[in-house]
Amino acid sequence: MNGRVDYLVTEEEINLTRGPSGLGFNIVGGTDQQYVSNDSGIYVSRIKENGAAALDGRLQEGDKILSVNGQDLKNLLHQDAVDLFRNAGYAVSLRVQHRLQVQNGPIGHRGEGDPSG
């Protein structure tokens, strides 16, 4: 019997300071290139090593970015979303949605890592 996969969705405000090479991540998504079916949202596709986002540590690949400096990212073309990030200020505030996968085993199931009583 397989366990059920649930998702724990949390939101976080992440304030990044632009480093010498910028914010340091890539995005996918937008109304013209949906990354998730029936969702035109903007998602983090890559965190660049030693970039501002990586050094901060909170932004993760797969996170959905809801807004930049208070500006909603809904219903934007991909390139318009990219422009919004590139042309934002030195201090950038991101509203981010983290989606954490939670594995729920059936009742009475003891996972391999569980200590035996």
């Epitope: 910028g22 991540f25 995005i27 390139q79 318009d80 990219v82 990030f85």
Partner: nanobody
Framework: HVQLVESGGGLVQAGGSLRLSCQAS????????MAWFRQAPGKEREFVAA????????YYADSVKGRFTISRDNAKNTVYLQMNNLKPEDTAVYYC??????????????WGQGTQVTVS
């Protein structure tokens, strides 16, 4: 590799005008988005204006709207910044930035060395 070379900076009186140019050279440049940023002494680098094609978009910082105009000549791989009615607070080093058109990075890929603009 792409090189960006700015020119056109200088000393101008308040109310005067300057036209900055930035030429992109290098085999890999593909007429992607280009922008101007500036950095005043003791301050952080700030966005001034940007231009993109496909679909065409032009953006300005609120502080320069109505005074500065960004344009580009794709045949020459050059972007211009026409600056009118200059104010002392426009004094800064002006930097050109460019990105490859297919880049999904939220950062500009290339930066110039900057050109000084001083408004007295």
């Amino acid at each position: 590799h792409v090189q960006l070379v700015e020119s056109g900076g200088g000393l101008v009186q308040a109310g005067g005008s300057l036209r900055l140019s930035c030429q992109a050279s290098g085999r890999t440049f593909d007429s992607g988005p280009m922008a101007w940023f500036r950095q005043a002494p003791g301050k952080e680098r700030e966005f001034v204006a940007a231009i993109r094609r496909s679909p065409e978009r032009i953006y300005y910082a609120d502080s320069v709207k109505g005074r500065f105009t960004i344009s580009r000549d794709n045949a020459k791989n050059t972007v211009y910044l026409q600056m009118n009615n200059l104010k002392p607070e426009d004094t800064a080093v002006y930097y050109c930035a460019a990105a490859l058109s297919r880049s999904t990075s939220v950062d500009y890929d290339y930066w110039g060395q900057g050109t000084q603009v001083t408004v007295s």
